[in-house]
């Protein structure tokens, strides 16, 4: 690495992956193992994040970027940059202080994380429930029968029940 010659800040020419080493006349030195600098002109390299325990490595640390962690199976990330791992529950459950609990009637959770949410109230939109809700799934709303046709009341009374082939009376 060559000595920087900047008249203003000699460290500004140090690229990402290096640091400006004050102990060596501000020469740009490479980041030591298990450290990185993601921008140029840095006077120190940052220590790489280590993904241990319930965390696992999603992306290895390099000289220019930090390691990225996610969670081991059965857990999911919370917080910026996956700062915490929280236990998964099954669909149809939510995590409480006492562990995973089934959603109460009238609520659902279609994911392994988060809380149980109330079923959609179709009638607020003037619709009907097409498919009933479950612990795992919201109701499906759709047109009420009266939105699809006027129904039997709209036509002349139907012919009496008969076998095909017989003319209506």
């Amino acid at each position: 690495f060559e000595r920087t010659r900047s008249l203003q800040d000699p460290c500004s020419n140090c690229p990402a992956g290096t640091f400006c080493d004050n102990n060596r006349n501000q020469i740009c030195s490479p980041c030591p193992p298990n450290s990185f600098s993601s921008a140029g002109g840095q006077r120190t390299c940052d220590i790489c994040r280590q993904c241990k325990g319930v965390f696992r490595t999603r992306k290895e640390c390099s000289s220019t970027s930090n390691a990225e962690c996610d969670c081991t199976p059965g857990f999911h990330c919370l917080g910026a940059g996956c700062s915490m791992c929280e236990q998964d529950c099954k669909q149809g459950q939510e995590l409480t202080k006492k562990g995973c609990k089934d959603c109460c009637f009238g609520t659902f959770n279609d994911q392994k994380r988060g809380i149980c949410r109330p079923w959609t109230n179709c009638s607020l939109d003037g619709k009907s429930v097409l498919v009933n809700g479950t612990k795992e799934r919201d109701v499906v709303c759709g047109p009420s029968p009266a939105d699809l046709s006027p129904g039997a009341s709209s036509v002349t009374p139907p012919a009496p029940a008969r076998e095909p082939g017989h003319s209506p009376q």
Epitope: S128, L130, V131, N132, G142, P143, P145, A146, D147, L148, S149, P150, G151, A152, S154, V155, P157, P158, A159, A161
Partner: antibody, heavy 111, light 112 residues
Framework: QVQLKESGPGLVAPSQSLSITCTVS????????LSWIRQPPGKGLEWLGV???????NYNSAFMSRLSISKDSSKSQVFLKMNSLQTDDTAIYYC?????WGQGTTLTVSS | DVVMTQTPLSLPVSLGDQASISCRSS???????????LHWYLQKPGQSPKLLIY???NRFSGVPDRFSGSGSGTDFTLKISRVEAEDLGVYFC?????????FGGGTKLEIK
Amino acid sequence: QVQLKESGPGLVAPSQSLSITCTVSDFSLTSYDLSWIRQPPGKGLEWLGVIWAGGGTNYNSAFMSRLSISKDSSKSQVFLKMNSLQTDDTAIYYCTTVHYWGQGTTLTVSS
Amino acid sequence: DVVMTQTPLSLPVSLGDQASISCRSSQSLVHSNGNTYLHWYLQKPGQSPKLLIYKVSNRFSGVPDRFSGSGSGTDFTLKISRVEAEDLGVYFCSQSTHVPWTFGGGTKLEIK
């Protein structure tokens, strides 16, 4: 998941009768009307008749003399019966609630 | 019987274009209960028709908001604001106000 499924014979000889069953799941035949519609090869859609939620029926007058629609709500099934079939009855037959349709059953009338 | 007339028969479009399909009925589709039972379907090759719009202007569950319906009485329109590849197929209008229920002859939406 709302589903309608037609089951029919596939091939019928001229002058013979047709029976098709429509089996529905995840909704009630006591709430929704169910119609039968057919589509001849490469052509448009033709309404045959309806069985209303309450059990009454109405038929397209063009088929009135040879068509019957009935249902067994407890089994979630609707039945279409048509007799005196001719080659021009060859079509895909659909059951539908207007908002949901079955995948259709293909009928060929041929000797 | 109520005759439903759709125009055009074929509608060549470029992806991203707006498309408009007209449907006219031979008599008013306003029922004595005040509702107008005019519906729009899309049928793709080898599939059954799928409901897009019911009662003139109501989008069915899961139908993208690029589809819209309008009209009244005897004159109705289906508009697709930005045509996507998955929109190609045959569009039918249908009325269930009067027995027998009837369908338009279909409009084939295809790539220009």
